[in-house]
């Protein structure tokens, strides 16, 4: 391990389709790669009307967007379906959405997830 | 092991459209991009764009924006790149890669545009 | 992005070696690890060979290696064998904020 990276070894896993996918709904998925890639989690949500819907979270392959991030946070303006990734095992346990491009402070929270 | 396969070779023509499929199997599809490529005969490699298999979101090389819809259907792990009023210039081979690296491709797909 | 410049063809004997420069910007090439090489042999699909500058993709041999010197990459080929004999395209990561690139490729001929 290289001296102040967090290695990611397992995600907090969420699938909202998890029976259409034939998978679980919930649990923690431990992150498979080749063994010399970096390995993150990822959370993506939609915001229904100011109601956070969790759509999937889970592992994510080598990503220079999710290098050295220990949170997860979305900076994209107002995408249509939410993205963060992280590193650091389960780091994708809490999302935010802090757009880049905004002038003003953030309207929006930090979210903790609550499965359904 | 890792596997992208792609759907098979398409003579269209000009001003038509083209549907390539690209079927991942080997590893979890909604755990990294899909990026597409051609290569028109004897040509290099030019990048088209990439989707997020687990969001949607997309990027397109500014070239074909307006042009190209990248998509895909994560119950069965297909990626699909749409190309639209079809030029004889896009003759080419097709190619799906996994990833921001571009670590494994798929066989490639011959698109084809002549009258 | 403008494409990455590569050299249209480079030669050496087995047993040589070879390297083949890609240069970009101060803001792809010089400014960030993320350029990669690939090998395309004839009629196949191109394989990742080296990513992030210098990471070697596993199961690639030790003769193939990679670098960064400013605001140009290179690979270098030890050991020259003809099936080392391919066109090669350095390329950069493409994803989330990434918008991807390639040089025009290089056609590598073992004499």
């Known amino acids: 391990a290289i001296l102040g990276r967090s290695e990611t070894q397992e995600c907090l896993f969420f699938n909202a389709n998890w029976e259409r996918d034939r998978t679980n709904q919930t649990g923690v998925e431990p992150c498979y790669g080749d063994k010399d890639k970096r390995r993150h989690c990822f959370a993506t949500w939609k915001n229904i009307s100011g109601s956070i819907e969790i759509v999937k979270q889970g592992c994510w392959l080598d990503d220079i967007n999710c290098y050295d991030r220990t949170d997860c946070i979305e900076k994209k303006d107002s995408p249509e379906v939410y993205f963060c990734c992280c590193e650091g095992n389960m780091c994708n346990e809490k999302f935010s959405y802090f757009p880049e491009m905004e002038v003003t402070q953030p309207t929006s929270n930090p979210v903790t997830p609550k499965p359904p | 092991q890792v596997q992208l396969v792609q759907s098979g070779a398409e003579v269209k023509k000009p001003g038509a459209s083209v549907k390539v499929s690209c079927k991942a199997s080997?590893?979890?599809?909604?755990?990294?991009?899909i990026n597409w490529v051609r290569q028109a005969p004897g040509q290099g490699l030019e990048w088209m764009g990439t989707?997020?298999?687990?969001?949607?979101?997309?990027s397109y090389a500014q070239k074909f924006q307006g042009r190209v819809t990248m998509t895909r259907d994560t119950s069965i792990s297909t990626a699909y790149m749409e190309l639209s009023r079809l030029r004889s210039d896009d003759t080419a081979v097709y190619y799906c890669?996994?990833?921001?690296?571009?670590?494994?491709w798929g066989q490639g797909t011959l698109v084809t545009v002549s009258s | 992005q403008s494409a990455l410049t590569q050299p249209a063809s480079v030669s050496g004997s087995p047993g040589q070696s070879i390297t083949i420069s890609c240069t970009g910007t101060?803001?792809?090439?010089?400014?960030?690890?993320?350029v990669n090489w690939y090998q395309q042999h004839p009629g196949k699909a191109p394989k990742l060979m080296i990513y992030?500058?210098?990471k070697r993709e596993s199961g690639v041999s030790n003769r193939f290696s990679g670098s960064k010197s400013g605001n140009t990459a290179s690979l270098t080929i030890s050991g020259l064998q003809a099936e080392d004999e391919a066109d090669y395209y350095c390329?950069?990561?493409?994803?989330?904020?990434?918008?991807?690139?390639f040089g025009g490729g290089t056609k590598l001929t073992v004499l």
């Open positions: 992030g500058v210098s």
């Open positions: 890669a996994r990833g921001g690296w571009f670590d494994y």
């Open positions: 989707i997020n298999a687990v969001s949607g979101s997309t």
């Open positions: 101060s803001s792809d090439v010089g400014s960030k690890n993320y």
């Open positions: 080997g590893y979890t599809f909604t755990s990294s991009y």
């Open positions: 390329g950069t990561f493409a994803g989330g904020k990434y918008y991807g690139v």
